[in-house]
């Protein structure tokens, strides 16, 4: 046992973290109960919200480049929300990871995958919008749903690639008080002769790389894209921002507010190796900012609905559709709906960046709705006049 433990060395900050005792303070225990309740609620909300967004955007809306971005963002958030119940369980059992090392690695990887995917996708959305305004002709010819899906696949692959070190260096470490931590152990692989230096360099490398790749670079891309679009639209005399602009602004703001504190504390934690005085501050703050980062996945669907009135309308109609499908008689099904169904070509041009917030005509009659529902998500509601009228250079 002892020899085995010696074979798995720990960085000083991790060793000292393992000494932190569970709270005996009653008021802190109340905070713990509240945290479990809050995370439990967030888990439920996140799963339902993102599931509904995926259904509404993926199935009830005409597939455009914009809906593709939102679809992938919602998928990333759904993944994060799906891991939240396990984090809630970790809190509920007294901040102890009782689900094993493999699941510890997987659970943490989902958190980081969501972090990278969100940053990359928001960058892509901003660049896409920038291209529409700055290179309208190019965008008209090359902006397709298929191309957007391909870009998303590449971004997912990059996100997975960036998540690998977090999967590799995640470990379960027993605390002094018997609880189990699921945390970084950067000495898991090739610790080298100078363990202190290895701890410092790897911790800094992880913190700085995730700050740059998942936060600073995406925000820089978003800011410069926004600046380029604003400059171009000023020349055209456009003033009022479009609905999609408001949606992107809200999602980006939420991303910055939710992930910013996490990255600050992550960098402080890396600094705490050389500056031990920072450790208590990091240990106090990290659980809160990690939760805040998780809550970004719960906030996004709310923002889609709040900044996009049409989303709410479609949401209501979709729920009504589901109820109708449950209540309708078998004889009413027929095949009328499916015969009139029109598939959206994967290479169809996206009419506008406002497609997510436009008002296409809804199919009428329960049979039509049910036929569409039974035809899974392939059926595309007809394009409305507003969508058709919008130019591809709208902001």
């Amino acid at each position: 046992m002892s020899a085995n433990a010696t074979l798995k060395p720990l960085c000083p900050i991790l060793e000292q973290m393992s000494r932190l005792q569970s709270h005996s303070n009653t008021s802190i225990r109340y905070i713990d109960h509240a945290a479990v309740l809050l995370h439990g609620l967030a888990s439920l909300l996140g799963l339902v919200e993102n599931g509904v967004i995926l259904f509404v955007v993926g199935c009830r809306m005409r597939q455009t480049v914009v809906t593709t971005w939102v679809l992938h963002l919602a998928l990333s958030d759904l993944l994060a929300s799906a891991s939240l119940p396990f984090f809630t369980y970790f809190l509920a059992v007294g901040h102890s990871w009782e689900l094993g090392t493999t699941f510890c690695k997987l659970h943490s990887s989902i958190f980081f995958l969501n972090m990278f995917a969100s940053g990359f996708l928001l960058s892509a959305i901003s660049l896409d919008r920038c291209l529409q305004v700055v290179r309208p002709v190019w965008a008209q010819n090359h902006r397709t749903v298929a191309a957007a899906h391909k870009v998303c696949l590449v971004l997912w692959a990059l996100a997975v690639l960036n998540t690998v070190p977090y999967f590799v260096f995640r470990d379960t470490i027993s605390r002094l008080d018997g609880r189990i931590m699921c945390y970084y152990n950067v000495l898991l692989l090739n610790p080298g002769p100078d363990r202190d230096a290895t701890c410092n360099s790897r911790q800094v490398a992880l913190a700085v790389s995730k700050f740059l790749l998942a936060f600073l670079v995406p925000l820089a891309i978003i800011a410069s894209s926004h600046a380029a679009v604003s400059l171009r639209l000023q020349h055209r005399g456009r003033r009022r921002p479009g609905r999609f602009v408001r949606l992107v602004a809200a999602v980006v703001a939420a991303f910055a507010l939710c992930w910013g504190p996490y990255h600050v504390f992550s960098l402080l934690e890396a600094r705490a190796h050389a500056n031990p005085g920072l450790r208590p501050l990091v240990w106090r703050g990290l659980p809160f900012v990690t939760s805040l980062a998780f809550f970004n996945s719960v906030a996004n669907p709310v923002l889609y609905v709040l900044t996009c009135p049409d989303m709410l309308r479609k949401l209501r109609r979709s729920l009504r559709t589901v109820l109708e499908s449950v209540l309708v008689d078998d004889s009413e099904l027929g095949g009328a709906g499916s015969s009139r169904r029109r598939r959206t070509s994967s290479t169809a041009r996206s009419a506008s960046p406002l497609a997510l917030c436009s008002r296409p005509e809804e199919p009428r009659g329960p049979a039509r709705l049910l036929g569409w529902l039974l035809g899974s998500c392939a059926a595309s509601p007809q394009t409305g006049p507003l969508n058709r009228a919008l130019s591809s250079t709208s902001s």
Epitope: M1, S2, N4, A5, T6, K8, L10, P12, E15, Q16, S18, R19, L20, Q21, S22, H23, N25, I28, S174, L176, D177, G178, D196, A274, N275, P276, G277, L278, R279, P280, W283, R284
Partner: antibody, heavy 122, light 107 residues
Framework: QVQLQQSGADLVRPGTSVKVSCKAS????????IDWVKQRPGQGLEWIGA????????HYNEKFKGKATLTADKSSSAAYMQISSLTSDDSAVFFC???????????????WGQGTSVTVSS | DIQMTQSPSSLSASLGERVSLTCRAS??????LSWLQQKPDGTFKRLIY???TLDSGVPKRFSGSRSGSDYSLTISSLESEDFADYYC?????????FGGGTKLEIK
């Protein structure tokens, strides 16, 4: 009250090994680390290493790796340090001490054993 | 390893006198420093931890302070039982290291 009771003084031959014990009482044994410290006359204090009795996880000073082996027995709430291949340099007083943590911080060596004198002589 | 330089190595003082011992860390230890007292019978007692927090049961005449990488132990008014050996200990990182010690003697 917290107490760390160490085994008595030992006179041992060079090349052999010695095992010093440290019996803990008055607290939850597995919730704290046990540190071991060496004191030689005129040479000050040297930290040998520490053991987490709950998991058996050990941390050694590089200088004492291969020389000292730390173990713990949860059932008897005792920690042990074995020193092998004894030489005259190993003649010293060895202390065990308790280290732990609070909710948001950690500390070291709040309680000490009375010390065990080990004399290596032929 | 972090080196702890303790001064003075020995100190003669009278009862009621105010004395200060200093420890300097070779690198940042962020306040993770304890002051230990070793009585003539060899037993150890921790007086201060986290640079300035007094242990329970330790008289108020003992106090700890920090100024950058310099840490001090001050005894405001010496009493007979205070004449002993004093050591500083850094526990910021492994391996823990001690100061060379200060022998406090009666003048």
């Amino acid at each position: 009250q917290v107490q760390l009771q160490q085994s008595g003084a030992d006179l041992v031959r060079p090349g052999t090994s010695v095992k010093v014990s440290c019996k803990a009482s008055g607290y939850a044994f597995t919730n704290y680390l046990i540190d071991w410290v060496k004191q030689r006359p005129g040479q000050g204090l040297e930290w040998i290493g520490a053991i987490h009795p709950g998991s058996g996880r050990t941390h050694y000073n590089e200088k004492f790796k291969g020389k000292a082996t730390l173990t713990a027995d949860k059932s008897s709430s005792a920690a042990y340090m074995q020193i092998s291949s004894l030489t005259s340099d190993d003649s010293a007083v060895f202390f065990c001490a308790r280290s732990g943590g609070s909710s948001f911080d950690y500390y070291a060596m709040d309680y000490w054993g009375q010390g065990t004198s080990v004399t290596v002589s032929s | 390893d972090i080196q702890m330089t303790q001064s003075p190595s020995s100190l003669s003082a009278s009862l009621g006198e105010r004395v200060s011992l200093t420890c300097r860390a070779s690198q940042e230890i962020g306040g993770y420093l304890s002051w230990l007292q070793q009585k003539p019978d060899g037993t150890f007692k921790r007086l201060i931890y986290a640079a300035s927090t007094l242990d329970s049961g330790v008289p108020k005449r003992f106090s700890g302070s920090r100024s950058g990488s310099d840490y001090s132990l001050t005894i405001s008014s010496l009493e007979s039982e205070d004449f002993a050996d004093y050591y500083c200990l850094q526990y910021a990182n492994y391996p823990y290291t001690f100061g060379g010690g200060t022998k406090l003697e009666i003048k």
